[in-house]
């Protein structure tokens, strides 16, 4: 039960995280104009990964896309790449994890296959979350550097000329959305990996026939794992898997522990 809950929760958390990463990537407010020096401006600037916007007090907002690719700073391109990689990995991870969910039965898919898929999706979520966090952090670092450079320019001037135009930018809402979303995706991925450990077949399973006081016969599958009857054995709450595939009738005839999870 705990494994399914962990897996399900990991999926939901990752889903929210990836939705957040997508939202952050699309948002225009990665950097917003710092109003410290001019709190009464009638024009407010903010920038995203794809376009820059100007909002006037009247409510009018004008946005311009970055139509050049080569003219953009390398750091911005890197951030874009990290966020897109994060989204792609996250989307693939979600797709894989849907099929890996314990509560969803797909044909005669073995639990070992589901465990592998859970691990794969978990790793994908972790990498996706790290990509988002890295992307947002690189952008934040870029902002901090530019902020202090422009602050210095305000007072010292450039090349002996005092600059009259100095628009400083500070952290926008998208950065916080990105950090939180990346963190959630990362947590979701870790949860999926933890769930995988619970789903995976134990290496220390008994290779011999186990005897029970009950009258139920025990199927012995040579070279495989012990098939649990669901009675008496497995007292340590371990998941035990059949070495071979079972039919639906067998599942109903001989209920095993994982059928109730």
């Amino acid at each position: 039960m705990a494994v399914t809950a962990c897996q399900g929760l990991g999926f939901v958390v990752s889903l929210i995280g990836i939705a957040g990463i997508i939202a952050a990537t699309c948002m225009d407010q990665w950097s917003t104009q710092d109003l410290y020096n001019n709190p009464v401006t009638a024009v407010f600037n903010y920038q995203g990964l794809w376009r820059s916007c100007v909002r006037e007090s009247s409510g009018f907002t004008e946005c311009r896309g970055y139509f050049t690719l080569l003219g953009l700073p390398a750091m911005l391109q890197a951030v874009r790449a990290l966020m897109i990689v994060g989204i792609v990995l996250g989307a693939i991870g979600l797709l894989v994890s849907i099929f890996a969910l314990k509560c969803i039965r797909i044909g005669s898919m073995e639990d070992s296959a589901k465990a592998n898929m859970t691990l794969t999706s978990g790793i994908m979520f972790i990498v996706s979350g790290l990509c988002a966090i890295a992307g947002v952090s690189v952008f934040a670092n870029m902002l901090v550097t530019n902020f202090w450079m422009s602050t210095a320019n305000m007072y010292t001037g450039m090349g002996g000329m005092v600059q009259t135009v100095q628009t400083r930018y500070t952290f926008g809402a998208a950065l916080f959305v990105g950090w939180v979303a990346g963190g959630l995706t990362l947590i979701g991925g870790v949860m999926m990996c933890i769930a995988c450990r619970g789903l995976a077949p134990e290496e220390t399973n008994y290779k011999a026939v186990s005897y029970h006081a009950s009258g139920h016969s025990v199927a012995y599958k040579p070279g495989g794992f012990k098939a649990s009857t669901g009675f008496g054995s497995n007292t340590k709450n371990k998941k035990i898997y059949d070495g071979g595939a079972r039919t639906e009738d067998e599942v109903q005839s001989y209920p095993s522990k994982h059928d109730y999870v």
Epitope: N38, A42, V43, T164
Partner: antibody, heavy 116, light 113 residues
Framework: QVQLKESGPGLVAPSQSLSITCTVS????????VHWVRQPPGKGLEWLGV???????NYNIALMSRLSISKDNSKSQVFLKMNSLQTDDTAMYYC??????????WGQGTSVTVSS | DIVMTQSPSSLTVTAGEKVTMTCKSS????????????LTWYQQKPGQPPKLLIY???TRESGVPDRFTGSGSGTDFTLTISILQAEDLAVYYC?????????FGSGTKLEIK
């Protein structure tokens, strides 16, 4: 067509308050802001404040303490209220429609004289 | 507050001449985000309310004759009337609409000889 018309008391006693109404037609106050500007006799223009479509306002800091701008969208009216008037508040008061922070349509103005 | 300084304060010219008046702001009116200068020019004829001539320093308002041209960027702006006509007798004001409070220049009074 777009029209703005100011209506005021004309004469106000010193230390009294002033109330002017700007009635607009041809546009909605939910879509456009309205500025207030005054002009003392023979002098230049002075911006008083603005009320935006959402109802938020910006004022001239020098007059902020005694100035208030409000509106009634359904009646298409904007109100200017100024307290503690002095003789140097004698001016022609105009309301003007905002368009991208510029004032594209102006009312004819209402003359206000502060005198005892 | 941004201080707007207009020069000359008055100008007497003959019809048909080219007229140039300047406006200086104490701070830049150029917005980096959209590369627009938030400076507006108004014309006020005697006994009338002001009329919008030019916004964003160089964009002519619809219906304004093309003899009126606005130019400049940052802190220095110019209004040019290429061929002065009798009906251009007025006071011309520049206005900062970038930062509150929106401030007007003291005006340039245009008189015809």
């Amino acid at each position: 067509q777009v029209q703005l018309k100011e209506s005021g008391p004309g004469l106000v006693a010193p230390s009294q308050s002033l109330s002017i109404t700007c009635t607009v037609s041809g546009f909605s106050l939910t879509s456009y802001g309205v500025h207030w500007v005054r002009q003392p006799p023979g002098k230049g223009l002075e911006w008083l404040g603005v009320i935006w479509p959402g109802g938020n306002t910006n004022y001239n800091i020098a007059l902020m303490s005694r100035l208030s701008i409000s509106k009634d969208n359904s009646k298409s009216q904007v109100f200017l209220k100024m307290n503690s008037l002095q003789t140097d508040d004698t001016a022609m008061y105009y309301c003007a429609r905002d368009r991208r922070l510029a004032m594209d349509y102006w009312g004819q103005g209402t003359s206000v004289t502060v005198s005892s | 507050d941004i201080v707007m300084t207009q020069s000359p304060s008055s100008l007497t010219v003959t019809a048909g001449e080219k007229v140039t008046m300047t406006c200086k702001s104490s701070q830049s009116l150029l917005n980096i985000g959209n590369q627009k200068n938030y400076l507006t020019w108004y014309q006020q004829k005697p006994g009338q309310p002001p009329k919008l001539l030019i916004y964003w320093a160089s964009t002519r308002e619809s219906g304004v004759p093309d003899r009126f041209t606005g130019s400049g960027s940052g802190t220095d702006f110019t209004l040019t009337i290429s061929i002065l006509q009798a009906e251009d007798l007025a006071v011309y004001y520049c206005q900062n609409d970038y930062s509150y409070p929106f401030t007007f220049g003291s005006g340039t009074k245009l008189e015809i000889k």
